[in-house]
């Protein structure tokens, strides 16, 4: 978790002098509770936006927006703590809006936004806005939270972001898998424009079951420049196991930008259709 272009952070708006500060996620009001505290944020909204860094890289960011309730507690609002928790790593990052002037009611509802938390593809975050000071131990909570899922690199808008492109999102291998005679599979895919090796991972399963009955790995050496964007054809030999008929073919590239952590593409071959009714067994066996 990180912030995008930390230098450009602003929270001031007409009628309010405000500064954005780094936060330890442990506001002073936790340790030294105040008697009078503001009410919670209203209408917390989160959207996925995209922002360029000064270097020109494009990153997905969480656009966080909320409004204030129109009650008298606005007079005791000193700021807000914005917290983003990445659920699979438990990593948390916070910033603090520090109000340098008193808020006053005006003709329209106060609205705040922040769009500088960089988020990763295919990750889930808990986004929380806490009004400051935080409530006394038994006080009503004055925060709002939402669990936000970021699309993966298959998503059309995500595909062109720097983290997705770095993991090979622009490569479309257009995999085709064909079942041949004599327990073989022909796998065909389009090579990318990089002289790097690939790995084909074959996993076979019985019909309707999820534990594998056969696994095989096939190494494809790095193509020469004249082979870039060409089709690569590989024939894989299957183990002759009856019922081991559903095959998942996964292609793992090793691009220089992502090494052994590149996006993998896969294709599946289903078991052949079984006839609904079994063939009738004759009640006599012919002798000829």
């Amino acid at each position: 978790l990180r912030l995008l272009d930390h230098r450009a952070l602003v929270c001031s708006q007409p009628g309010l002098n405000c500064t954005v500060k780094n936060s330890t996620c442990l506001d002073d009001s936790w340790i030294h509770p105040r008697n009078l505290t503001p009410s919670s944020p209203k209408d917390l909204q989160i959207q996925l936006h995209f922002a360029h860094t000064q270097q020109g890289d494009l990153f997905p960011v969480a656009h966080i927006e909320w409004t204030l309730q129109t009650d008298a507690s606005i007079l005791y609002l000193e700021g807000a703590e914005l917290s983003v928790l990445q659920l699979n790593t438990n990593e948390r990052l916070c910033v603090r809006f520090e109000f340098l002037s008193k808020l006053r009611h005006h003709h329209r509802r106060w609205r705040f936004t922040f769009s500088h938390f960089v988020v990763d593809p295919d990750q889930e975050y808990e986004v929380t806005v806490h009004h400051l000071p935080k409530p006394i131990p038994d006080g009503d909570p004055n925060h709002q939270s939402k669990n936000f899922l970021v699309p993966d690199c298959e998503h059309a808008r995500m595909k062109v972001t720097t983290p997705c492109m770095s993991s090979g999102s622009l490569w479309d291998p257009n995999i085709t898998v064909e079942t041949l005679e004599a327990h073989q599979l022909r796998v065909s895919f389009t090579l990318w424009n990089e002289s790097t090796h690939y790995q084909i991972l074959l996993t076979s399963f019985p019909h309707m079951e999820n534990h594998s009955c056969f696994e095989h790995m096939h190494h494809i050496p790095a193509p020469r420049p004249e082979e870039f964007h060409q089709r690569s054809n590989v024939t894989l030999t299957l183990r002759n196991l009856k019922g081991c008929c559903r095959h998942q073919v996964q292609i793992q590239p090793f691009f220089s930008s992502c090494l052994n952590d590149c996006l993998r593409h896969s294709a599946t071959v289903s078991c052949p259709e079984m006839p609904d009714t079994p063939e009738p067994i004759p009640d006599y066996m012919p002798l000829w």
Partner: nanobody
């Protein structure tokens, strides 16, 4: 322009099933999370279910959990709601709604809904 058209509503007996469809046009369906929202007669709007852009994440209101199933077919630009074991209290006008922003939030909307269908009426009565 963006259009959402619901269908599949009707009169059904308690305990029976119904399948609602929502046909989307005017935008790329696989970019956005989609939701079903309902309004019972004389009541306010109630969020029913949501599904992420690729169908990987599904969420339901407690009142329908275990009975309703949301799904989508991006190739057909369609959203569905399979409703089983229907109850009298499921009687409502059912709307499909498009999430305004990109991304998906568990248990409801991340931002707000910027487009709604005209609704399809589901009446559960014996």
């Amino acid at each position: 322009q963006v259009q959402l058209v619901e269908s599949g509503g009707g009169l059904v007996q308690p305990g029976r099933s119904l399948r609602l469809s929502c046909a989307a046009s005017g935008f790329s369906l696989d970019d956005y999370a989609m939701h079903w929202v309902r309004q019972a007669p004389g009541k306010g709007l109630e969020w029913v279910s949501g599904i992420s852009w690729n169908g990987g994440s599904l969420d339901y209101a407690d009142s329908v959990k275990g009975r309703f199933t949301i799904s989508r077919d991006n190739a057909k630009n369609s959203l569905y709601l399979e409703m089983k074991s229907l109850r009298d209290e499921d009687t409502a006008l059912y709307y499909c709604a498009k999430e305004k922003g990109l991304g998906y939030c568990r248990g409801g909307s991340c931002s707000s809904f910027d487009y709604w269908g005209q609704g399809t009426l589901v009446t559960v009565s014996s």
